[in-house]
């Protein structure tokens, strides 16, 4: 096979190459029905790779290791990347506004109305923002036909099976154009479990409308599924700035507020909370966190979504028990004990239960210090100390923040603690706090975290 | 609840590679985020690597590079690829499902010499 593995050869197998090169050939320029575009330089397997890489924000080696091979795994769109359908003829957007969908079949998984409800819905996040406007017909050729089938389905791209490739869509264009396939060996639902309806809809949608995939993590548009939570759906910044370049603006945009994805080296950057994970550094924003290795200067970005489900969307502090291999997340009143991915049973609890007093309504940023088996916990101007080894809050606390290390203000945003060294975060700035001398010994941008 | 077995431990020199299973049985594998976990002699047991559901993983500082976890959910197995493995490395290797209150193995032991 032409495609290489890093490492030993005995990483992976023969199986997993089989499913990278299948991969490649799906969603990085994949040829035609007729085999009319012949293997050359730019279409090369190992070519294939480092886009797919570039594509995912990996490091781009052009071989086939793990981290690479975990994306290629995650359930996704079946539309391609890099490279389009070639089956087809397409235009870059529909000519007119007033567009109409036919649902042509159900799927057994919901209800008829919970169907229509989640087509219609989705329709409504790409109308909500431009002039376009959808109408349902019940019989005959609408411009978007939506299906539901399972593996070859008629139009050559077929379906795999549970998992995997969720749906796919057409471009803007006659016949197959338009049209959006779900995969009914799915479990579809209207929750967080199996995979949501109205979510794959409403980029599979994005792509009828002439959007291709987003590299932005937090776009709709983005390959691969997350489960965004039960809240009211924003569309992201980015889908938003995609689809009015096609079609412009609407009249009233009903939620102005659309999501940015966070930019690491803004020099306005303040963050939420960071905290540490078996060796790496979490450093969360928004919806958002970025993962750090200590051998690695490019932070991978993460949905907050996509490793804990049942977290909260943003959270506020963090803390890692590392002897424990535990680390707790904090959010309004609430507070989560996570072992890696999964939530301890109990949680989450409320946060008066640690012997906080019922008028703190969220921590801010806290702090562990394994050597002592303490915990700060920061909330507006006060710090309070928490003994994790006896579950029981220190006396003499709360105090305020501006006595106990005067210099850093009176908030904090978030807080590590590393090799006897404090690091506090405020606003677009941080301070490097000496334990041992209780002083500030430097004042640096807050994104100097992330190699910034 | 999942019942697991490890399998696949074994002595091996410095340099050298071997592949640990875990296979499943009982209730839905799929639904949990499968971990291995190792306990070396006089030491507390520490995690080695995870992944969650949605296949995302996670190593522990000291194998990241030479440990690949993966798993299979059709099979019900998970496994872990364990490359350029060291002295240090030696310890009886547990599969876990479902984090620290979920469900473990009997341990699978693996010895490297130098």
């Known amino acids: 096979l032409p495609l290489p593995s890093g490492g030993d050869e005995d990483d992976l197998s023969e199986e997993d190459l089989q499913f990278a090169e299948r991969y490649l050939r799906s969603y990085y320029h994949p040829t035609n029905l007729a085999g009319i575009l012949k293997e050359n330089a730019a279409s090369s397997m190992t070519e294939r790779l480092r886009e797919m890489q570039s594509f995912f924000g990996l490091e781009v080696t052009g071989k086939l290791d793990d981290n690479t091979l975990d994306v290629m795994k995650k359930p996704r769109c079946g539309v391609p990347d890099v490279g389009e359908y070639n089956v087809f003829p397409r235009t870059l957007k529909w000519s007119k506004m007033n567009l109409t969908y036919r649902i042509v079949n159900y799927t057994p998984d919901m209800t008829h109305s919970e169907v229509e409800k989640a087509f219609k819905k989705a329709f409504k996040v790409w109308s909500d923002v431009t002039p376009l406007n959808f109408t349902r017909l019940h019989d005959g050729i609408a411009d978007i036909m939506i299906s539901f089938g399972i593996k070859e389905h008629g139009d050559f791209y077929p379906f795999d099976g549970p998992s995997g490739l969720l749906a796919h869509a057409f471009p803007p264009g006659p016949n197959y154009g338009g049209d959006a396939h779900f995969d009914d060996d799915e479990t579809w639902t209207s929750s967080s479990k199996g995979y949501n309806l109205f979510l794959v809809a409403a980029h599979e949608f994005g792509h009828s409308l002439g959007l291709d995939h987003s590299k932005d993590p937090g776009a709709l548009m983005f390959p691969i599924y997350t489960y965004t939570g039960k809240s009211h759906f924003m569309l992201p910044d980015d889908d938003v700035q995609g689809i009015q370049s096609l079609y412009g603006p609407g009249d009233e945009d009903p939620n102005p507020k659309h999501p940015k994805t966070p930019d690491k080296c803004d020099p306005s950057l303040s963050l939420d909370a960071i905290t540490s994970l078996r060796g790496e550094t979490m450093i969360f924003k928004d919806r958002f966190f970025w993962r750090l290795h200590p051998q690695q200067v490019d932070a991978e970005l993460f949905l907050t979504k996509s490793f804990w489900p049942e977290l909260p969307n943003r959270i506020d502090a963090a803390y890692e028990h590392p002897s424990h291999d535990l680390i707790f997340i904090f959010r309004g009143r609430k507070f989560w004990a996570l072992n890696g991915y999964d939530i301890l049973e109990g949680y989450p609890k409320k946060i008066s239960e640690l012997g906080l007093p019922k008028e703190v309504k969220k921590i801010s940023a806290a702090v562990h210090f394994e050597d002592t088996g303490k915990t700060l916990l920061f909330s507006g101007n006060q710090v309070w100390r928490y003994d994790d080894t006896n579950h029981i809050m220190d006396k003499d606390y709360p105090r305020l923040i501006e006595e106990d290390f005067p210099g850093i203000g009176d908030k904090v945003d978030a807080v590590y603690e590393k090799n006897g060294y404090i690091y506090f975060f405020n606003g677009p700035i941080q301070f490097e706090y000496s334990i041992w001398s209780n002083r500030i010994v430097r004042v640096m941008p807050a994104n100097s975290i992330l190699w910034c | 609840e999942v019942q697991l077995v490890e399998s696949g431990g074994g002595s091996v020199q410095a340099g050298g590679s071997l592949r640990l299973s875990c296979a499943a049985s009982?209730?839905?594998?799929?639904?949990?985020?499968m971990n291995w976990y190792r306990q070396a002699p006089r030491k507390q047991r520490e995690f080695v690597a995870g992944?969650?559901?949605?296949?995302?993983?996670h190593y522990a500082v000291s194998v990241k590079g030479r440990f690949t976890i993966s798993r299979d959910n059709a099979e019900g197995t998970g496994y872990l690829q364990m490359n350029s493995l060291k002295p240090e490395d030696t310890a009886v290797y547990y599969c876990?499902?479902?984090?620290?209150?979920?469900?473990w193995g009997l341990g699978t032991l693996v010895t490297v010499s130098s």
């Open positions: 009982g209730s839905t594998f799929s639904r949990y985020s």
């Open positions: 992944i969650s559901t949605a296949r995302i993983t």
């Open positions: 876990n499902a479902g984090g620290l209150q979920g469900s």
